[in-house]
């Protein structure tokens, strides 16, 4: 059995040239004819040179999985799905995303160091001493309040709570 060159496919004991991306095999090669190809029908595609008798079905972006269509399918390229705003891709296969997760909300005591994108979760960072954050989408930790000369510090601030002052 012959081993075919790259971008050829085996038919019986003959090697046939593959079809171009966007096409599938309509008629395999013979003694006098090369491979006859046909364009992929709507909603199907082939992304690479191929020996397929049928094109592949285009992917569908499932809104229930947090997905939206970012790029429509063409005859030579599968649908590209992206996560809806506020979500990031959990399972990425090349340019195809299958499931999305909601961006992490930073807990109290942390700030947003890097906002979440369609393919990356939010990155949180601890507040430095002397600052605090209630969490959520805050990008900066706030400095603790300095009690005035007419006030008394009842409770020192933490990374998640402000200083508590009381009037004398």
């Amino acid at each position: 059995q012959p081993s075919c060159r790259q971008e050829e496919f085996l038919v019986g004991d003959e090697c046939c040239p593959m079809c171009n991306p966007g096409y599938h095999v309509k008629q395999v090669c013979s003694e006098h004819t090369g491979t006859v190809c046909a364009p992929c029908p709507p909603q199907t595609y082939t992304a690479h040179a191929n020996g397929l008798s049928k094109c592949l079905p285009c992917g569908v972006c499932d809104p229930d999985m947090g997905l939206l269509t970012w790029q429509e399918c063409s005859s030579w390229k599968d649908t590209v799905c992206r996560c809806i705003p506020g979500y990031f891709c959990e399972n990425q296969d090349g340019s195809h995303c299958s499931t999305c997760l909601q961006h992490t909300t930073c807990p109290p005591g942390q700030r947003v160091e890097k906002r979440g994108t369609h393919d990356q979760d939010t990155v949180c960072a601890d507040c430095l001493t002397g600052t605090f954050s209630l969490g959520g989408t805050q990008e900066e930790c706030l400095p603790w309040t300095n009690c005035s000369a007419f006030q008394q510090e009842v409770r020192r601030g933490t990374n998640s709570t402000d200083t508590t002052c009381s009037s004398q």
């Epitope: 060159r5 790259q6 050829e8 040239p17 006098h32 004819t33 090369g34």
Partner: antibody
Amino acid sequence: EVQLLESGGGLVQPGGSLRLSCAASGFTFSGYYWTWVRQAPGKGLEWVSTISASGDSTYYADSVKGRFTISRDNSKNTLYLQMNSLRAEDTAVYYCAHDRTFGYFDYWGQGTLVTVSS
Amino acid sequence: EIVLTQSPGTLSLSPGERATLSCRASRSVGKYLAWYQQKPGQAPRLLIYAASSLQSGIPDRFSGSGSGTDFTLTISRLEPEDFAVYYCQQYGSSPPITFGQGTKVEIK
């Protein structure tokens, strides 16, 4: 003797239409694929369109898809190319060619010149 | 689409000399390659098909070789009538059928 005679070329304005014909004699017309190939002035050869022996399959270059239509009349031994929405870049000598099996071209016509200009 | 690249662009030779023309495909076309000769003001003429099969009526000084991506047209001894432009054409995977840009063989 095999003869292919193209006709229908000429000067046409951008956006206009032309219908080319290719009359074949000297061999069986119906059993073979037929093809149109063009050549812009001073340039190389460019495949345009092919029609299968039965006429049920047609193939087009991306540059003409949706604008050109290939057809055949086996009773008249004639091949046609209907060209619509013509553009300046369609200016070329158009050759019809006897295509053995959607492959190589063993007989060619003498060509007909299509000029698209305002 | 499969792109065919011919080299050299121009070949300057004298009658009686050997001409070697190259055609390279961007990916494999198997054996499905043809060569044509075209003279000014004339239609192309088929010389070789299936990479190495000589078309009937073509002198045997013309020969073709190669498969896959690399092909050669050889004219063993150039005759005055051989000075012309030569095109390769693939039909390994079609549509589209594609041609090389041509090699001009001129008298030195």
